[in-house]
């Protein structure tokens, strides 16, 4: 929006005649104390719209706040608008007069307000008092606005000085009421019930002497009304309850119940609403997915949690390898279910220090008397691997052949690799890898067990090497998901009178 | 404050054209709005066109596509090319200037625009 002139205050002759033109992308219109003065709308050659607002005959009673807005706002991403402020001084005109209501001001906390004494010229001196008293309050004064702070129940004028004479508005009336605010809060004993059980529903509202409590609720659509009790609490003043009280729950009243408190004495009213859930018969059912397979590192801790809903509340066991599981007096196992709200439950089982024998086929089952589910996984304990040996040996054939033996969980993978420079690899020059079939020179052999007992992967490797001619560092490495151990040997040809 | 004198009304047929201009006493190329208004007889002074500072000019439904206004800053001018004349454009036609800082408008003096059918 284009506004000519642009403002944001203007001050203007009294008598004289001033032209607003306001310009944009759709059609605008003024607007002065919410209603549409008379105005030419109009559109330019670019295309865009205009209003143009002419005030003829200007006085002090068209002092005031002027808007320019689009005509109709929907559909625009902005809902702009434009503020001019207009002054006429004017000293026929003392304070712009004030809607009756304006004079009242009622207060229900402690909270700035404007005392709305306007006037026309904004080089006038204005100035706030107590009706009673001639002493000039320090209250801030906006001339399009009038005195903005926090007051007392008192009544308040403000004065001026037009030429030579003293000008009062009307007094202004500040009232505090001592009425809180309604504040309602809506309980149920459970929000999920199974047919036949009861329903219990608690509308509390604090600080409040007198009100009244309305229900409503699925069985009141149906012409089946059900009568609530109300009580004081004593012990906390001013809090009232209103209790619902259904027996015997049927599905039909599943939905929402909304529980409405007015007080009469200033109108004030809130309500609030509950879901309700009625169920045929109780449930459990697995929130989120837990893979059949899960890891768990040695010597580490490990927690696996279980999410799910259930109604009525679920007894929950654990198994290993169809044996039940329960909190271990060693610390070693710790369970417990807890429940994160009123039908959502997570049951975790922490192993401590995990170690090799509590790999197995766990199953978690939860279950009452109207359902049941179970999760099973199997866990498996991941092992860092180890070379348990590295040793190097002179076969009658006359080639020489490097053994390496390791162990790990999940089966570890062999890396054999050599440096032939033994001064500058493998800090300058990289090893070279060993075991390649189109290499002649070495010649690989492994072989991979799995022990049972220990749950985990043997891995043997042998190195047939062809010729050595001079001292070579032959290093096994051992990789897996949790780790990777190397050893290195000197080989030195069948020629040479020592070996390191 | 500037004074406005306007010239170039008279008797004319309908469909026939007319010019009116709008002579300022000093330089009009700092107003901010300048335009032009006419009072037909019995009736409230009503816009026809007016030209914003920003160069936008806008005219009122009626006369759209039939009447032009013009400015000419060097010669201190406002005009108002008036074509296919109908009698309801019979009327006093006022220029106008304004300017936030004179606090209000200026008039000339009109000039009376007649046409017959």
């Known amino acids: 929006l284009v506004v000519t002139p642009p403002g944001p205050e203007l001050v203007l002759n009294v008598s004289s005649t001033f032209v607003l033109t306001c310009s944009g992308s759709a059609p605008v219109v003024w607007e002065r104390m919410s209603q549409e003065p008379p105005q030419e709308m109009a559109k330019a050659q670019d295309g865009t719209f205009s209003s143009v607002l002419t005030l003829t005959n200007l006085t002090g009673l068209d002092t005031g706040e002027y808007f320019c807005t689009h005509n109709d706002s929907r559909g625009l991403e902005t809902d702009e608008r434009k503020r001019l402020y207009i002054f006429v001084p004017d000293p026929t005109v003392g304070f712009l007069p004030n809607d009756a209501e304006e004079l009242f001001i009622f207060l229900t906390e402690i909270t700035e307000i404007t005392i709305p004494c306007r006037v026309t010229d904004p080089q006038l001196v204005v100035t706030l008092h107590e009706k009673k008293g001639d002493v000039a309050l320090p209250v801030p004064y906006d001339h399009q606005r009038g005195f903005s702070g926090i007051f007392e129940d008192r009544s308040y004028i403000c004065k001026t000085t037009i030429g030579d004479r003293e000008v009062d508005s009307d007094a202004y009336y500040v009232y505090r009421l001592q009425v809180s605010s309604i504040n309602v809060s809506v309980n149920a004993v459970q929000t999920v019930v199974r047919q036949g059980e009861n329903i219990t529903l608690m509308c509390i509202v604090i600080g409040n002497e007198v009100v009244n409590f309305e229900w409503t609720y699925p069985r009141k659509e149906s012409g089946r009304l059900v009568e609530p009790v109300t009580d004081f609490l004593l012990d906390m003043p001013y809090h009232i309850r209103s209790i619902l009280h259904i027996p015997s729950a049927e599905l039909e009243d599943s939905g929402t119940y909304t529980c409405n408190v007015t007080e009469s004495v200033n109108d004030h009213q809130d309500e609030k609403a509950i879901n309700i859930t009625v169920v045929e018969s109780g449930y459990v059912r697995l929130l989120g997915e837990v893979g059949t397979l899960q890891f768990a590192e040695l010597h580490r801790s490990r927690t696996l949690q279980v999410v799910f809903e259930a109604y009525p509340p679920p007894t929950v066991l654990w198994f290993k390898d169809n044996r039940t599981l329960g909190d271990s007096s060693a610390g070693e196992i710790a369970l417990s279910t807890r429940n994160v709200s009123e039908t959502r439950y997570v049951s975790e089982l922490t192993l401590v220090r995990v170690k090799v024998a509590e790999a197995g086929h766990y199953t978690m089952r939860a279950f009452h008397e109207d359902a049941e589910v179970q999760l099973s996984f199997q866990l498996q304990i991941n092992v860092p691997v180890r070379v348990l040996e590295l040793s190097e040996s002179h076969p009658d054939s006359g080639e020489q052949t490097v053994r390496c033996r390791g162990r790990g969980m999940p089966q570890p993978n062999i890396i054999w690799s050599a440096c032939r420079d033994l001064k500058r690899c493998p800090r300058e020059l990289p090893p070279t890898l060993l075991g390649n079939s189109s290499e002649e020179e070495s010649q690989l052999e492994t072989n991979v067990t799995y022990w049972e007992e220990e749950q985990e992967f043997e891995v043997v490797s042998t190195l047939r090497l062809q010729h050595v001619d001079r001292p070579l560092s032959v290093r096994c490495t051992l990789r897996n998901a949790v780790g990777q151990d190397t050893q290195e040997v000197i080989v030195v040809p069948h020629s040479l009178p020592f070996k390191v | 404050e500037v004074q406005l004198v306007e010239s170039g009304g008279g008797l004319v047929q309908a469909g026939g054209s007319l010019r009116l201009s709008c002579a300022a006493s000093?330089?009009?190329?700092?107003?901010?709005?300048m335009g032009w208004f006419r009072q037909a007889p019995g009736k409230q002074r009503a816009l026809v066109a007016i030209?914003?500072?920003?160069?936008?000019?806008v005219y009122t439904n009626s006369v759209e596509g039939r009447f032009t206004m013009s400015r000419d800053s060097a010669k201190n001018m406002v005009y108002l090319q008036m074509t296919s004349l109908e009698p309801e454009d019979t009327a006093v036609y006022y220029c106008?200037?304004?300017?936030?800082?004179?606090?209000?408008?200026?008039w000339g003096q009109g000039t009376q625009v007649t046409v017959s059918s």
């Open positions: 106008y200037a304004q300017t936030t800082a004179w606090r209000g408008g200026v």
């Open positions: 030209n914003t500072y920003g160069g936008r000019t």
């Open positions: 000093e330089s009009i190329s700092s107003i901010e709005q």
